[in-house]
């Protein structure tokens, strides 16, 4: 019995088509993704193959004004155009609370919503249940199979589930779901979730009766074959794991941003054994017209958008100096209102012993690409802030050594006075230079606010301790020679969209005067 | 659980034909197919063809197609193999099956004698 | 027709031993290999498919890999329940094929 497995991930908020980088779409001949293209191939194949399941492995929240101004009501409305068979929670559909799930998502979806490893406890576990699941079990052609959600468990760091959530250990969580499956005389056993590549190789190995892994949350971009993009495959699609009682178990991702559309055909026996799996991306470009329909319903809801960008989101009663002569020279406070509110985004008490479970932000000069005049009224628009950081990344949470990081505070001014993007910006870091020394050598003083303390102050950077760091996705993936971050990183995690994370921060404060301060000297 | 249950031993005379069943059950019968697989004494195992139980459609060896028809009966989840012109040589058991060979029937003793 | 040619046809092995049995096709055949074991009263049973994933109950002392057109079966230290013949099937085109098959007899 063959199946066809349709999937997505990490498709945030990426509604509309983009540009080959998964940037705003400029030359609509080179765009690709986008729901209404993604539909096009999903129906070519739906009408071709007898047994199809689309997927998706969360994330869908977060990412472009879409979501700043929808909520989350456009991610339950286009996947429940699209048909969408089963989703399960990402870390970032809590990132405007349970509410901000319960009400646009959880209500409003026509496919079940799964994490095994999500428990509700308090007034929470009456109010959200029966809204998501652990498990479902579809009916596909003749067959039946069972899908089982999981989510990060380190989604209370990245996100804003409450205290009325516990986040399990996966593997702890999925097993006696699976093994439930198997007394209703499920056979065929997919895993569907949001917890990284790694994580989802340990799912495949570990959880008896897992017969497939769907995964999220690490972009992971698997390819047979020569890809067909600038994507750089990280193993074979499927990636196959050898689970620890004997069994070949398929894994698989799609990259990200809807990009991609997975598509993984399994042969199954009679026993529900994997007899064979072979597939690949689809790249979904221009040479897959748009849904006419599904265009026109894009277009439709666009338009709220577009009024939304020219509203007041808050005030400025300072020059929000953004421009290049002073943020790739000194600290300026374009750059200090981007850091604060990269950690103000990022406020997570979930340990008495800290105040916050990270304090620092580091921000490259030369992705701060305009500044904002307070003589026009004061008034900060999001069109304004889409001036400022253009280029549709996020701010990612990553654990680095204090060595490397003493590494990227060098590589900062190691040709100082070039205009070079990588001189970079602060929070929660005091940083003294002596551009007289030679390059490699000029960082004199780095003291670093601490996290477990009730009372935060700043101490010497320790080489061998591991920091948590907030900072652009384009630094944590090495841009601007920042190599040593991209090849230390010890852990990795994807965050909210740049604009979105300042714009929230504006409106919360109302009124805003970031000053220069002496975070770098 | 999967089950396959074969009909019992047959003799047979040469020129004859022979019609074997089998049937399944503890899963979905229609979503499958099944192989037929002869034995013949103190030898090693042959393929003969396989029919899918949902349409019917079958594939046969070479050495077998114009003798060898495989049909099915979706209302009792049985499927038949009927073996014709029947000679000494095709005195063997032969077996049913599933689709991926994870589950086989009893074996079916078929003797060709005159 | 991909003929597999199953080596040796029989062997003699003691209790606890480590035995290898191998499959050569005629050309590739992926993953498209099963083991089969037959036990004296003639019944069959699938210990591996795919080449390397074993089925439910088979003891994990068994296990198969390779790729391509060379294929093996290891049993990694002989049980008195594992006297028995074994082949392999290839299933990557029609018609499907079998090996001759490897007699394991007690030393």
């Known amino acids: 019995w063959e199946l066809t497995i349709l999937h997505t991930n990490d498709v945030h908020s990426r509604l509309e088509q983009t540009s080959e980088d998964s940037s705003k779409c400029v030359n609509a001949s080179r765009c690709m993704g986008g729901v209404a293209r993604l539909f096009t191939k999903v129906q070519q194949i739906r009408r071709a193959e007898p047994n199809v399941l689309l997927l998706d492995a969360g994330d869908q929240y977060q990412g472009t004004i879409w979501f700043t101004v929808y909520k989350g009501a456009e991610v339950a409305h286009f996947m429940n155009a699209l048909r969408y068979d089963a989703m399960a929670l990402g870390n970032h559909e809590f990132d405007n609370g349970v509410e901000g799930l319960i009400e646009p998502l959880l209500k409003e979806a026509k496919f079940p919503i799964l994490s095994a490893n999500i428990k509700a406890k308090g007034p929470l576990a009456s109010q959200i249940s029966g809204l998501y699941l652990p498990y479902k079990v579809l009916p596909v052609g003749d067959e039946v199979v069972g899908i089982v959600g999981y989510t990060s468990k380190e989604t209370p760091f990245l996100s804003n589930p409450g205290t009325n959530l516990v986040f399990e250990d996966e593997i702890t969580a999925l097993q006696p779901e699976v093994d439930k499956l198997k007394t209703l005389n499920v056979n065929k056993i997919i895993a569907l979730g949001h917890s990284g590549f790694e994580m989802d190789k340990l799912i495949a190995q570990k959880v008896r009766g897992v017969d497939v892994v769907v995964g999220g949350h690490s972009n992971t971009f698997l390819y047979t074959g020569n890809p067909p993009s600038k994507e750089v495959p990280a193993g074979k699609y499927p990636f196959i794991v050898t689970s620890d009682d004997g069994r070949k178990v398929p894994v698989v991702q799609a990259y990200a941003f809807g990009k991609y559309l997975g598509y993984l055909k399994i042969e199954f026996d009679e026993r529900g054994n994997v007899i064979s799996s072979h597939g690949n991306p689809i790249l979904l470009n221009s040479s897959i017209p748009e849904d006419p329909s599904i265009k026109a319903d894009i277009n439709k809801w666009r338009i709220k958008l577009d009024n939304y960008s020219t509203q007041e989101l808050g005030k400025t009663i300072v020059y929000l100096d953004g421009s290049s002569q002073s943020c790739r020279f000194r600290e300026c406070n374009m750059g200090n209102l981007i850091c604060d509110a990269m950690i103000n985004n990022n406020l997570r008490h979930t340990d008495e012993m800290f105040w916050n479970h990270v304090s620092m932000c580091i921000l490259n000069g030369g992705g701060i690409r305009s500044p904002i005049d307070e003589r026009n009224n004061g008034t900060i628009t999001w069109e304004n802030l889409a001036a400022v950081l253009p280029f549709g990344g996020t701010f990612d949470l990553v654990q680095l050594k204090g060595s490397t990081l003493k590494k990227a505070f060098e590589h900062s001014v190691h040709r100082y006075g070039q205009s070079t993007g990588e001189f970079l910006q602060v929070g929660g870091i005091h940083v003294v230079y002596d551009l007289s020394r030679k390059p490699g050598d000029r960082v004199v003083k780095l003291d670093v606010l601490c996290t477990k303390c009730r009372v935060p102050s700043y101490d010497p950077l320790k080489m061998d301790e591991v920091y948590k760091v907030i900072l652009p996705n384009f630094l944590a993936n090495g841009g601007d020679g920042f190599q040593m971050i991209k090849d230390e990183l010890l852990r990795h995690d994807s965050g909210d969209q740049d604009i979105n994370v300042v714009s929230t921060y504006i409106s919360k404060m109302k009124v805003i005067y970031p000053a220069v301060e002496g975070r770098i000297k | 659980e999967v089950q396959l249950v074969q009909s019992g031993a047959e003799v047979k005379k040469p020129g004859a034909s022979v019609k074997v069943s089998c049937k399944a059950s503890g899963y979905t019968f229609t979503a499958y197919f099944m192989n037929w697989v002869m034995q013949a004494p103190g030898q090693g195992l042959e393929w003969m063809g396989r029919i899918y139980h949902n349409n019917g459609d079958t594939f046969y060896s070479q050495k077998f197609k114009g003798r060898v028809t495989m049909t099915v009966d979706k209302s009792t989840s049985t499927v038949y193999m009927e073996l014709s012109s029947l000679r000494s040589e095709d005195t063997a058991v032969y077996y049913c099956a599933t689709s991926y060979v994870g589950d086989w029937g009893q074996g079916t003793t078929v003797t060709v004698s005159s | 027709d991909i003929q597999m040619t199953q080596s040796p046809s029989s062997l003699s092995a003691s209790v606890g031993d480590r035995v290898t049995i191998t499959c050569r096709a005629s050309?590739?055949?992926?993953?498209?290999l099963n083991w089969l074991q037959q036990k004296p009263g003639g019944a069959l049973k699938r210990l591996i498919y795919a080449t390397s994933s074993l089925d439910s109950g088979v003891p994990s002392r068994f296990s198969g890999s390779g790729s391509g057109t060379e294929y093996t079966l290891t049993i990694s230290s002989l049980q008195p329940e594992d006297f028995a013949t074994y082949y392999c099937?290839?299933?990557?085109?029609?018609?499907?094929?079998f090996g001759g098959g490897t007699k394991v007899e007690i030393k």
């Open positions: 050309q590739d055949i992926g993953d498209s």
């Open positions: 099937l290839q299933y990557a085109s029609f018609p499907w094929t």
